[in-house]
């Protein structure tokens, strides 16, 4: 139990896509403010988003330090204007988040088809290798850098003139597929991490079709 007018945060939820990671919670504060702390299982607590009236806190900078670690966050509630005040047990009121392991749980963002190039009866489709906020040696890593061969892409492709789809897979960011000469094709891709049990698949990319500006044709 906390001070009379302070309520504990609840519904603590991790929202994470391509490692951009925000902790959200309820309720909207009335006469109270929040501070968030984050820690790895074996590490020290680090405070973030001090005395905020927001109900979210961007924890990306912390989790990208090691995306394979498991993190726990907690949200402290303080009376507005009296942040030194504590609960009856002498501690501020707080609520723990679920554990969160970014490598296993971050959602895969919607991929984008970067380009496609036709040479005769082959088409090379390239998926954009999205940059993440994960850093190594002062450079930002791409999704492929982080996940390596754990990440695959599924390509859906079909003749513009028909509805019958085909599919192909790659564990790089490129597909080389056979097509019928003289036919226009449309493409969509989906990212998948087969080894996961949750958040395994992205949404489909926007559809790109031959005859539009992303493509190139060569005899």
């Amino acid at each position: 139990s906390g001070t009379t007018n302070t309520v504990a945060a609840y519904n603590l939820t991790w929202k994470s896509t391509n490692f951009k990671t925000i902790l959200e919670w309820e309720p909207k504060p009335v006469n109270q403010v929040y501070t968030v702390q984050i820690s790895t299982k074996s590490g020290d607590w680090k405070s973030k988003c001090f005395y905020t009236t927001d109900t979210e806190c961007d924890l990306t900078d912390e989790i990208v330090k090691d995306v394979k670690q498991t993190y726990l966050a907690r949200v402290f509630s303080y009376p507005a204007g009296n942040v030194e005040s504590t609960g009856s047990a002498g501690e501020p009121l707080y609520e723990n988040s679920p554990e969160f392991t970014p490598y296993l749980e971050t959602n895969l963002g919607q991929p984008t088809i970067q380009s496609f190039e036709q040479v005769g009866t082959k088409v090379n489709v390239t998926v954009e290798d999205e940059r993440t906020l994960v850093r190594r040696n002062n450079t930002f890593l791409s999704l492929r850098d982080v996940f390596g061969k754990d990440l695959i892409y599924t390509l859906y492709y079909w003749k513009s003139s028909s509805s019958g789809k085909k599919t192909a897979k790659t564990n790089t960011n490129e597909f080389l597929i056979d097509v019928d000469k003289g036919e226009n094709y449309c493409f969509s891709v989906q990212a998948v991490i087969p080894s996961r049990t949750v958040n395994r698949k992205s949404t489909d990319s926007p559809v790109e079709c031959m005859g539009q500006e992303k493509g190139e044709f060569r005899e």
């Epitope: 695959i152 897979k169 698949k201």
Partner: antibody
Framework: EVQLVESGGGLVQPGGSLRLSCAAS????????MHWVRQAPGKGLEWVGW????????IYDPKFQDRFTISADTSKNTAYLQMNSLRAEDTAVYYC??????????WGQGTLVTVSS | DIQMTQSPSSLSASVGDRVTITCKAS??????LSWYQQKPGKAPKLLIY???SLADGVPSRFSGSGSGTDFTLTISSLQPEDFATYYC?????????FGQGTKVEIK
């Protein structure tokens, strides 16, 4: 525990239709691809097609494209195979399988479809 | 479409024998190949995926190798419970295709 249970098989006349169901438990089908594979008596395995239940994308072996339709109901956690214009050569055990995108890790027990007059 | 040619179609072997089954793809499928074991009246069971990776719970006497067009399933020391039919499957592009199967029988 992950389980796939097919149902809906049986005896049907040539030219008839049948809808097979694949009820999944222990996981959410929208997180995976779901396939149908068939096996004629004494023969090998033959891939029919797949669905991504999350977005409804379907892929078929072209030989089945015109007569077979795969669908899914994520609220029932069930995939379906609608088979029309059935022929004697469609007689087979029909299996559904879960696909992680790297392998088919779970299969149902199969349901026998017999097409005969 | 990619054809998968599996050989032999059947073989007779004794307990303790080393058994090798091959699958040849009509074109490059990288490592998008898995192997399945099927016993009469039962559903197929995953043994090997991505060509060399052993599925959970599968005994280490089973191994897979190869990439591109040529793949091999090896059983290092055949056990009584290994008498079954084995199938390869390419899942790199549609239509996915199975090999014709290899029936491993008791000599």
């Amino acid at each position: 525990e992950v389980q796939l249970v097919e149902s809906g098989g049986g005896l049907v006349q040539p030219g008839g239709s049948l809808r097979l169901s694949c009820a999944a438990s222990g996981f959410n089908i929208k997180d995976y691809y779901m396939h149908w594979v068939r096996q004629a008596p004494g023969k090998g395995l033959e891939w029919v097609g797949w669905i991504d239940p999350e977005n409804g994308n379907t892929i078929y072996d072209p030989k089945f494209q015109d007569r077979f339709t795969i669908s899914a109901d994520t609220s029932k956690n069930t995939a379906y195979l609608q088979m029309n214009s059935l022929r004697a050569e469609d007689t087979a055990v029909y299996y559904c399988a879960r696909d992680t995108a790297a392998y088919f890790d779970y299969w149902g027990q199969g349901t026998l479809v017999t097409v005969s007059s | 479409d990619i054809q998968m040619t599996q050989s032999p179609s059947s073989l007779s072997a004794s307990v303790g024998d080393r058994v090798t089954i091959t699958c040849k793809a009509s074109r490059d499928i990288k490592s998008y190949l898995s192997w399945y074991q099927q016993k009469p009246g039962k559903a197929p069971k995953l043994l090997i995926y991505y060509a060399p990776s052993l599925a959970d719970g599968v005994p280490s006497r089973f191994s897979g190798s190869g990439s591109g067009t040529d793949f091999t399933l090896t059983i290092s020391s055949l056990q009584p419970e290994d008498f079954a039919t084995y199938y390869c499957l390419q899942h790199g592009e549609s239509p996915f295709t199975f090999g014709q199967g290899t029936k491993v029988e008791i000599k």
